[in-house]
């Protein structure tokens, strides 16, 4: 797991300050109010979003 400020979490994950580790964005379905879910919502859901402005 990556520490904040060094490298981003792997694809499909987001940093949780509460838990001090990268967490799976998939878990936001069950726990949408988790702190890291904001980072998941901001991330592009599919690769093609990275290719087109």
């Amino acid at each position: 797991e990556q520490a904040p400020g060094t490298a981003p979490c792997s694809r499909g994950s987001s940093w949780s300050a509460d838990l001090d580790k990268c967490m799976d964005c998939a878990s936001c379905r069950a726990r949408p109010h988790s702190d890291f879910c904001l980072g998941c919502a901001a991330a592009p859901p599919a690769p093609f979003r990275l290719l087109w402005p």
Epitope: L19, A26, R29
Partner: antibody, heavy 119, light 111 residues
Framework: EVKLGESGGGLVQPGGSMKLSCVAS????????MNWVRQSPEKGLEWVAE??????????HYAESAKGRFTISRDDSRSSVYLQMNNLRAEDTAIYYC??????????WGQGTSVTVSS | DIVLTQSPASLAVSLGQRATISCKAS??????????MQWYQQRPGQSPKLLIK???KLDSGVPARFSGSGSGTDFTLNIHPVEEEDTATYYC?????????FGGGTRLEIK
Amino acid sequence: EVKLGESGGGLVQPGGSMKLSCVASGFPFTKYWMNWVRQSPEKGLEWVAEIRLKSDNYATHYAESAKGRFTISRDDSRSSVYLQMNNLRAEDTAIYYCSPTYADTMDYWGQGTSVTVSS
Amino acid sequence: DIVLTQSPASLAVSLGQRATISCKASQSVSTSTYSYMQWYQQRPGQSPKLLIKYASKLDSGVPARFSGSGSGTDFTLNIHPVEEEDTATYYCQHSWELPYTFGGGTRLEIK
């Protein structure tokens, strides 16, 4: 290092009661839902009960086989979860494991405590 | 309840070869983005251990010879190349809804 220590198992007669305990360490207990899962040769792995967080008003959920007979509870100050089992039946004979889950995955498992219901 | 059917019930694979285990769900456990299926390993005399989460994501510390795939109702666990220490029973588990259910398990023996 995550540690989960189940205790309280043993031999009990049909219709009897038993309370299982699980003490946890090595992860932020108050942020994790806690589960009891049991395993028997007859039924394999079977989820039994789950308790959520203080912010969820300690919501509980049960397998159909546990409803009305089993009660899950937790003590965040002791990083412990409990399973009160009443009106035990022969089919409740199993190894009982506690396991934390943040949302979907049972991330860690203890060594389990064995429950035998027999006359 | 969602029923998970694993196959085969047991298999024997030669050291270094590929082991493939199937798990079929009685209804879809996937959204358009994620699949809510996990795989666990239980070595003889030990407790279950999480291997793969969300169908294909390896848990921390799990060797890369393990891989998971699938979506909807059909999921697969692959182990390649198998090693002696992979002798175990493997279980799938869904987290789509309550109650969580497990497959019946697949016992892997290394020849």
